[in-house]
Amino acid sequence: SDKLYQRKEPVISSVHTKVKGIAEVTENVTEGGVTKLGHSIFDTADYTFPLQGNSFFVMTNYVKSEGQVQTLCPEYPRRGAQCSSDRRCKKGWMDPQSKGIQTGRCVPYDKTRKTCEVSAWCPTEEEKEAPRPALLRSAENFTVLIKNNIHFPGHNYTTRNILPTMNGSCTFHKTWDPQCSIFRLGDIFQEAGENFTEVAVQGGIMGIEIYWDCNLDSWSHHCRPRYSFRRLDDKNMDESFVPGYNFRYAKYYKENNVEKRTLIKAFGIRFDILVFGTGGKF
Amino acid sequence: SDKLYQRKEPVISSVHTKVKGIAEVTENVTEGGVTKLGHSIFDTADYTFPLQGNSFFVMTNYVKSEGQVQTLCPEYPRRGAQCSSDRRCKKGWMDPQSKGIQTGRCVPYDKTRKTCEVSAWCPTEEEKEAPRPALLRSAENFTVLIKNNIHFPGHNYTTRNILPTMNGSCTFHKTWDPQCSIFRLGDIFQEAGENFTEVAVQGGIMGIEIYWDCNLDSWSHHCRPRYSFRRLDDKNMDESFVPGYNFRYAKYYKENNVEKRTLIKAFGIRFDILVFGTGGKF
Amino acid sequence: SDKLYQRKEPVISSVHTKVKGIAEVTENVTEGGVTKLGHSIFDTADYTFPLQGNSFFVMTNYVKSEGQVQTLCPEYPRRGAQCSSDRRCKKGWMDPQSKGIQTGRCVPYDKTRKTCEVSAWCPTEEEKEAPRPALLRSAENFTVLIKNNIHFPGHNYTTRNILPTMNGSCTFHKTWDPQCSIFRLGDIFQEAGENFTEVAVQGGIMGIEIYWDCNLDSWSHHCRPRYSFRRLDDKNMDESFVPGYNFRYAKYYKENNVEKRTLIKAFGIRFDILVFGTGGKF
């Protein structure tokens, strides 16, 4: 609450997060032309990335393009990309939607369709929908431990969200345990009025707000965090503005002396930890 | 503008960026002692890294040291590093400029020069100039979509820079389209009075400032972002303070049971998105 | 100092860091059943990661789990994980402490102990102590160059911590060179009253605070940074809240057409650069 006689100072904050959980993923795997069900286990080293600062990312879905090589090939026949003759293909042209540079030739993509040939990582990425339900939908049960150290330098005051009295096997609950700093990802979404299973398909950004409203006067000292949650990406966003949250990364390798890569389009939840508040003192 | 009767509150912000573009790179490639021109395509998975928060990086140039192995070898004969006898080489010494630990021996680097032998990733990185012009100079035509969600918790007000009415094929222009949040990298540099082609060689840091000056009173409500651009690294910086922007990373692999790595010195532009401003309400 | 007649504005900041140093690591290496002492060199590409923003990480210790494959195996017999019959093992169960999903069978881990079989990356990670002393304890002698560009947009004022007059071979010292922005990691810890050798074992978080108290009035202009250091992680933290600072990452590869990974549990120091302060002008 506003105490006008106090000197207010904004919080200086440092955050450290630790995600826990294992996901079992079942997907169709094609090997030697034969498709069968494959089961795999994903642990933290597989679904998170060593990231600093006030964000962490949990992969909830993915699309793989395996064994890509730098060469020439027909581009993917997405809407408006088909051709019937070379006239439709412009040598040196880079369509922002495409994944390569056109050679100027119109070539067969499959039995029925022709597209412009491109110099690219081939075969080019298929523009297929993200798997539904999400492959790592069980990430809903993962937990994250959030450690937050705060400082009011002008008041020479430091504290943190985890106190020695806290129990390391707690789980945050708005009513029953509002000071516990271990959060189940599904609960974060529920608190924000969002459906984890749905968001996991395309990805999204979730804000975890930590509000410190600190009264540092000795006679009425109070300085504990209040947690709240809200979705930060726009779920109603137009296709052209790239809804959800995803990024591409590659694993490079050599096979028979040929440089290859596996391209992974990773969908997931980026959690942004937004720390704010003030420390007031007479 | 300052309305003294208003209660002002700093902005809480979350940013999401998405880079688009393809670069064709032409460089000399040596294989089996034969040097020839090599062409390769770089897409987002090749020139960006999955990075969080208010920064994104676009690689514009690089120097590769391929096939390095942990062993003994002569260090690179940079200025002041040559020797004529073992006396000049101190066993166990790590010169901050060097890439290894000296063995104490002065050995031939080539026909005419001798340097101290080091235990290092060998052959040690040659201290050669970054290629000029930059290998990915065409990154000037890449675009970045910036999504910015802001919040004034005290006023319980949230908004974002992308409105439903916006057109996903727009490009930002200071005069014609100042609310479009898709930016051509070259335009950002032009607005900041900088030369992309030049900065791309050594790398640099570019600030994209998003200023929210929000009047949240219902009778004169206004809350839209204003974009501006300025270079953040010091282009006149002394050599000793490492001008430009680069970092080294490695790709590790095994060949004939020998652990090897390719070291990449990546030069590029780090874009920092600096969001600031206040929300005022009576 | 507070000048009440001045209009104060918070600092907008951008940070760029560059770590230098080489570590020689000696550890036991087992090959073909034979254990011998192995020496290796770690340079910046080996112990840091290309990270953005106001943080950088230096790996000071690690534990490797090499050649893991996705299959079935007994889980690690940590406290409370042993079993004597299948009744103790629940098919489909994921213990948050475990590294896999139980199959429901109780199987031999070694001659004397049985544990629940799991579907996981096998063999599962051994829960062994971080090596003591830390493998990269010599990181104490690494240095970091910190470049900080600041801006007070309301006052249209920009400056940086590195001035043209500065000497690139300086090292920060609180008394003798308080404006030098090249810091020896060991000195940072000493200034913060911490023992680098000790913290290097489990890792930790160290804050480098840069305080700008700027008087921008022309008649008494002053705007230089003041550096201070404090440890941000809680050294007295309970085991259950994961003391220190570590994360796991993996290097994936194929061997005889089998997908494998090496899991690295990296311990180290995350340095958070916390920039704050105000610019005041009449």
Partner: nanobody, 115 residues
Framework: EVQLVESGGGLVQAGGSLRLSCAAS?????MGWFRQAPGKEREFVAG????????RYADSVKGRLTISRDNAKNTVSLQMSGLKPEDTAIYYC???????????WGQGTQVTVSS
């Protein structure tokens, strides 16, 4: 460019010995030997750093082949004993920047091991 001249090849019985020599036109940090059997790729055999430190051998020849160097003369030799028919190949001398990295090769000398 470094000029390399090999000598000492020839025909030898299985179990026999042979000594290959190589002279370089200029001093170089590392010198080594590679071989190429008919229809196969060229493979590393042995390498030596300056003054014979460090030395490195392919697993298939360890204990049977010994590399030695004379820095003053810019020469390297390969003492081969306990030869097997599978050692039959053209043997190339090479120079480089470490015992793993070679840039220049000689013309080669033929070694034939008969059973």
């Amino acid at each position: 460019e470094v000029q390399l001249v090999e000598s000492g090849g020839g025909l030898v019985q299985a179990g026999g010995s042979l000594r290959l020599s190589c002279a370089a036109s200029e001093r170089t940090y590392s010198m080594g030997w590679f071989r190429q059997a008919p229809g196969k790729e060229r493979e590393f055999v042995a390498g030596s750093g300056w003054d014979g430190i460090p030395t490195r051998y392919a697993d298939s020849v360890k204990g049977r082949l010994t590399i030695s160097r004379d820095n003053a003369k810019n020469t390297v030799s390969l003492q081969m004993s306990g030869l097997k028919p599978e050692d039959t190949a053209i043997y190339y001398c090479a120079t480089g920047t470490s015992v793993y990295h070679y840039q220049y090769w000689g013309q080669g000398t033929q070694v034939t091991v008969s059973s």
